[in-house]
Structure formats: C-alpha cells, structure tokens
Interface confidence: low
C-alpha cells in the first residue's frame, strides 16, 4: 500500500509568493511559495495519485505583517482552504500566548491540530480539552494511519505558552500515545512535530512503533541529487535513520517558508512496514501556476495589510539614528533602540533564580538601513521600520560561549572605519574598543548584564561561560562574515519577525526617546 | 571522524581490468553520494561519476560510460570503482569523495594505479 | 561540459601577500562553484564550496567570491603552507568539470 506525504513546515506567516530568498516578492516572475501556488502543486498531485496527506509540522504563525494584523486568522482560513490534513503545533504558534493561539486557529481550523507532549493544567485544561489531540487517526484510502504530533519543549523560552501548559520530553511523551495506537490496531504511524532535525532523528530512533518523521523547527533542507534553488541540503531526501529496534525510519523537513512542498511516497507491506520510500521536496517556483480561487481570497485579505502600513504604531520624541555614518562607526540609537526591543520580546520569567533567561543583544550595523525623523509629528508606522529593517529577517536566540562573543567583538572592528556593516550594535552590553591595537586584539572591555541576578548588574565576559544572546538570523548564519557564530553556536532556535518585534515594543511604549548612552565606548 | 580508505596502489596488465575499494566509516554510509575522480601525473581532476549508495543510482561522466561501473556493498560501507579494458592511459591517481552541500568534502587518499607489462 | 577556465596556471608570492586565483565558467553555474587545495602527493582539500562558504576547519584567510560565470579565490595574507595547486569544481551539471589548476609557489 503506498501513501503520498506532503508537508510544509516553518511557513511563518509567507502566504503571498515571495522572492527566492523568501522576502517580499519584487519581480513576480521570479517569484515562489505562496498559499495560491501550494494549492496547485497539492491539487495536481490529490488527483494524480491515491493516497495523500497534506501535513504541516509547525509554526504556521509569525513572520510577515500578515501575521501582525491577523493574529492566526489567515491560518486557520488558508490551510482550511488547502484541506490540510493535520498540523502539529509550533513553539510560535504560542507567540500571542494561549488565547492566541486557541481562538484565531484551534477554533477555526477544520483539521486536526495535535502535539503529545503539551499537557495543560489548572483552568486552562479543560478550556483547551479537545482542541489539540496527542494523535489522531486519520482515514487514507481503504487504511488507517496514526498521526502522533510532538513540540519543541524549548517552547517556554522561546515564546509566551503561559504557567498552564507543561511541555515534556518528546520521546517520554510519544511513546505511550504510540503504543495506544498500536491497541487500536493502527500499525502506520507518524510522527509529524516541531522539534528540529537533531530530535526528529531521536524520535525515529527511539520511539518504538514510529515508522515516518515529518519535522520542522531548524528549516532544515534535505535533497537528493541537484538541489534546485540556493538552499544547501543538509542531507539526502528522506534522511534515513536506523531504529534502535533495527528499522529504517524515514525523516523528513521542507525547509521552511512555502518555498518547497516535501512529497514523501511510502510503501507498506501488509503489517504496516516500511519497504520504501523516495521523493524530494518540490520547488513551488513561477512554473507552477498560482491557483485563481486563492489567488483571489489573497487580493481581498490583502486590502485590510495595506491599510495598516500607514497607520501609526506609536511615537518618537528623538530622531531615531539608523544612518550608516553611525551605526556602522559608533553606538547609535536606533541600534539601541532595537536591541531593546529584541530583549523586551524574549522577556520570560521562567525561573526565580532569573530576571530573564536572556540579557544581551547584538545586532550588526549594516543590518539598520534607514533613519527615522522625529520632525514628522513623531509618527512611526510599519512602512518606517519596513524602511529600517527591510530584509524580512528574524530575531533569533542563540547560545555561545564567552570565547566566541569576544571573537564576534573582535570581528566587529577588525577594519574599522571602512564603513562596513559588521559594526555591532549592542543591548546588555558594555564593550571598550582600543583601535590603536592590531586587529585581533582591539577589545579590552567587555562586560555583559547577568541574568542570575535580582539587581542585573555589568560583569566581565567569562570566555569559558555559555551565554545567551538575541541577534538577527544573517548573524546566526554567519553574515557579514561572523562565520564563528555559525561554527561555535550551541544552540539556535529561530525567532519572531525583525519587524514585528519593533513594532510590539514601539506600541507598548508609546513614546519612546532613546538615547547613546555609553554601551560601545573608545579609549 | 569520517575516513574513506583505500588501497595505496594497484599494478595491473594492459587489457585487464581492475576493481578499486573506498571503505567508509565515520558516518551512515547510505546518506552521502560518493564520487570517484581521476588525477593524471601532472596533470588536473577529472570527475569520472558518483553513486548514492542508498539505492545504488549513478551519474557518470559520458567520457567514462564505458570504463567504469560503480556498485556499493552497503553491509560494509564501501564503494568501488571497476575499470576495464585497461591502458597506459587509465595509468592514475584515483579518489573517493563523499558529496555533502553538493560537493566534494571528505577525500579519500587515493589509489594509484599502475597499468603495465 | 562546461568548461571551467582558471588563472594564472601557475603564481608566485610572496609571505603576508594577498593572493587572488580566478576561474571562468563557459556558462553561468548559479553558484555551484568549489575550491580545493592540493598539496604534492597527498589528496585534494575542500576549502569552499557554493562559491563562498567556508569548509568548516579552513582558516578565515581563505574567501570566495563571485557569482555567473565569474568566481575567485582570495587568500588574504599568504602563508607558507598555503603553497600547493588550487583547483575549481563546478557541480551544477553533470558531468561536473574541474578547472586546469594554478600552482602557487613561494617567492
């Protein structure tokens, strides 16, 4: 019996095509992803063959001003529209916290939505009952499949899931929902989660009884042969990994954004073995039609995201520097104003030991493109920030050691004053820069604010500590030549629209005047 | 760590034909293309085909279509490389190369073989 | 095939001097475009691959640039064991081709 798997994963909110590097679409020839285009590709491949499940392994929220003014609302209509046949959650589909989460979509959606290791509590139980499942059957032709869900367990660092829903470990949960299903005589399973490439390869290790992994969360790219687009495969399409009970268990991702549709065909023998599988993930390029029908429900919610645009967000009292003659030279504070926003949206007290499980930012200066002026009645609107941010990043959490901060300082300055945008803007940070110094060797300062601390105080920088820091996704990937940061990261987990975590904080605030005030300092 | 061995040199007859070994280890065999590349005294790189060893489908340089075939035995994590119909020519340094990123990263140190009377 | 055209075939340099290696495609390669060092008697290095990523392990002298037709090797300040033959690869069609090599040498 063979099965077609399609899944999205990681789609952070790209409903219209985009550019091939998943940004605005520009030149719509060239353009990709795309609910319009998916439903095509998904359409095409229903009627062509029999058995097929359209699955999304999570985060669907966050990402464009899509998500900013629907709030989940376009997520639950346009998967509906796809008939999407399950989706995990995702540690941002908790970004707007539980509300958030369970009235624009757990309500809206007309497919089940699952993960196994959330378990709520408290008052929040028995609202939620019912509207995520640990599993779900689902019928598939003339057979069963079990589609188990899981969710990064790193959710309560990551985003805003409240005191009332414990994440546990993925492996301890899945196996006894797992089990269940094999009582129930379901003996084609997957597990369809949102927890990263390293544990989807745990789970099919470890989780008896699993025979797929569908995952998302670390926008991985696996392909076999030619890689069609710029996106470099990290591995072959399915990656196959080895049971601890002896079994080949497929895993697979689509990277992220809409840009691919993974189509994973799975043969089973009578008994719910695996006996093959193939298939890679499809690029949703201009040779793919977008369809009308969706095409045009885009333009109609597309009317209410103009709108909103130019409407204003909050105010400023102080011309708000991003000009490349100071962010690329000094400590300037529209940098800092950034920074700021960065750390107020990981704000998560998680932990009475902590103020916060994070406290520094860096940002590279390049990555400010405009300035804002206060003359304009102070008046700040997205389409400003869009001017200042306007690469459709993200804003991620990383962990380093002290040694590879410094080394990151240090690259900061290695050839000061060419203008060149690896200059870091700082938040929770004091850095002394001596440029008389050979490169290299130009940082003879470098304290960060605790995190362990009732009172957060300026530390030195412990070279063999691992910390945590916010910084722009082109950071964590090694931009503007911080190859370190991408070589000796910890850990990376990806974060909320660059954009929108500016606008958040802006909002909040108000009115916001900040300052230069002595973060990055000459001697 | 990833390693790819192979035999250090190989002295066949012209006419013959000769089978060369890549032994892998290090990494899940079946996850990685392997290529083989031909290097001449003096001279450059040729790139002769790669086999995925997960179901054994090859690319080849058509120069090299009717020289070499490429099979893997997975339950030993090694590929090979069969040439035939040798001459002075085929006379070379060969290497294994695991693909990752689409390209070449892990080398082998290469066979150097030796066709002659 | 694509021809893969590399220059010079062969340089000298000096030590703490800023070495440039240029390669030609006969078509544009979208960027599949490798670099590996090769030392006499041993096997080739991978030292960048997609025309400008750094093999994990190669020191940060090493850079590649370029995109289309047009790609290079920058070593920023030479050392001496970065003496030996530098090749091109291009993997974005079969049969993947090499360039001719250039033989860099110590002055």
């Known amino acids: 019996w063979e099965l077609t798997i399609l899944h999205t994963n990681d789609v952070h909110s790209r409903l219209e095509q985009t550019s091939e590097d998943s940004s605005k679409c520009v030149n719509a020839s060239r353009c990709m992803g795309g609910v319009a285009r998916l439903f095509t590709k998904v359409q095409q491949i229903r009627r062509a063959e029999p058995n097929v499940l359209l699955l999304d392994a999570g985060d669907q929220y966050q990402g464009t001003i899509w998500f900013t003014v629907y709030k989940g609302a376009e997520v639950a209509h346009f998967m509906n529209a796809l008939r999407y046949d399950a989706m995990a959650l995702g540690n941002h589909e908790f970004d707007n916290g539980v509300e958030g989460l369970i009235e624009p979509l757990l309500k809206e959606a007309k497919f089940p939505i699952l993960s196994a290791n959330i378990k709520a509590k408290g008052p929040l139980a028995s609202q939620i009952s019912g509207l995520y499942l640990p599993y779900k059957v689902l019928p598939v032709g003339d057979e069963v499949v079990g589609i188990v869900g899981y969710t990064s367990k790193e959710t309560p660092f990551l985003s805003n899931p409240g005191t009332n829903l414990v994440f546990e470990d993925e492996i301890t949960a899945l196996q006894p929902e797992v089990d269940k299903l094999k009582t129930l005589n379901v003996n084609k399973i997957i597990a369809l989660g949102h927890s990263g490439f390293e544990m989807d390869k745990l789970i099919a290790q470890k989780v008896r009884g699993v025979d797929v992994v569908v995952g998302g969360h670390s926008n991985t790219f696996l392909y076999t042969g030619n890689p069609p687009s710029k996106e470099v495969p990290a591995g072959k399409y399915p990656f196959i990994v080895t049971s601890d009970d002896g079994r080949k268990v497929p895993v697979v991702q689509a990277y992220a954004f809409g840009k691919y549709l993974g189509y994973l065909k799975i043969e089973f023998d009578e008994r719910g073995n695996v006996i093959s599988s193939h298939g890679n993930p499809i690029l949703l390029n201009s040779s793919i039609p977008e369809d009308p029908s969706i095409k045009a429900d885009i333009n109609k919610w597309r009317i209410k995201l103009d709108n909103y645009s130019t409407q204003e967000l909050g105010k400023t009292i102080v011309y708000l520097d991003g000009s490349s003659q100071s962010c690329r030279f000094r400590e300037c504070n529209m940098g800092n104003l950034i920074c700021d926003a960065m750390i107020n949206n990981n704000l998560r007290h998680t932990d009475e030991m902590f103020w916060n499980h994070v406290s520094m930012c860096i940002l590279n200066g390049g990555g400010i493109r405009s300035p804002i002026d206060e003359r304009n009645n102070g008046t700040i609107t997205w389409e400003n920030l869009a001017a200042v941010l306007p690469f459709g990043g993200t804003f991620d959490l990383v962990q380093l050691k002290g040694s590879t901060l410094k080394k990151a300082f240090e690259h900061s300055v290695h050839r000061y004053g060419q203008s060149t945008g690896e200059f870091l803007q700082v938040g929770g940070i004091h850095v002394v820069y001596d440029l008389s110094r050979k490169p290299g060797d130009r940082v003879v300062k470098l304290d960060v604010l605790c995190t362990k601390c009732r009172v957060p105080s300026y530390d030195p920088l412990k070279m063999d500590e691992v910390y945590k820091v916010i910084l722009p996704n082109f950071l964590a990937n090694g931009g503007d030549g911080f190859q370190m940061i991408k070589d000796e990261l910890l850990r990376h987990d990806s974060g909320d629209q660059d954009i929108n975590v500016v606008s958040t904080y802006i909002s909040k605030m108000k009115v916001i005047y900040p300052a230069v005030e002595g973060r990055i300092k000459f001697s | 760590q990833v390693q790819l061995q192979q035999p250090g040199a190989e002295l066949v007859r012209p006419g013959a034909s000769v089978k060369l070994s890549c032994k892998a280890s290090g990494y899940t065999f079946t996850s990685y293309w392997m290529n083989w590349v031909k290097q001449r005294p003096e001279q450059g790189l040729e790139w002769i085909g790669k086999?995925?060893?997960?179901?054994?489908?090859?690319h080849y340089n058509q120069k090299f279509k009717d020289k070499a075939i490429l099979t893997v035995d997975k339950s030993s994590s090694t590929a090979f490389m069969q040439l035939s119909s040798l001459t002075s020519e085929d006379s070379a340094v060969y290497y294994c190369?695991?693909?990752?990123?689409?390209?070449?990263?892990?080398w082998g140190q290469g066979t150097t073989l030796t066709v002659s009377s | 095939d694509i021809v893969m055209t590399q220059s010079p075939s062969s340089m000298y340099a000096s030590l703490g001097e800023r070495v440039t290696i240029t390669c030609k495609a006969s078509?544009?390669?979208?960027?599949?475009l490798s670099w590996f060092q090769q030392k006499p008697g041993k096997s080739p290095k991978t030292l960048i691959y997609?025309?400008?990523i750094l093999v994990d392990g190669v020191p940060s002298g090493f850079s590649g640039s370029g995109s289309g037709q047009d790609y290079s090797l920058t070593i920023s300040s030479l050392e001496y064991e970065d003496m030996g033959i530098y090749y091109c690869?291009?993997?974005?069609?079969?049969?993947?081709?090499f360039g001719g090599g250039t033989r860099l040498e110590i002055k």
């Open positions: 086999i995925d060893p997960y179901d054994s489908e090859t």
């Open positions: 690869l291009q993997y974005d069609e079969f049969p993947y081709t």
């Open positions: 190369a695991r693909i990752r990123y689409g390209t070449f990263d892990y």
């Open positions: 078509q544009d390669i979208n960027n599949y």
């Open positions: 997609r025309a400008n």
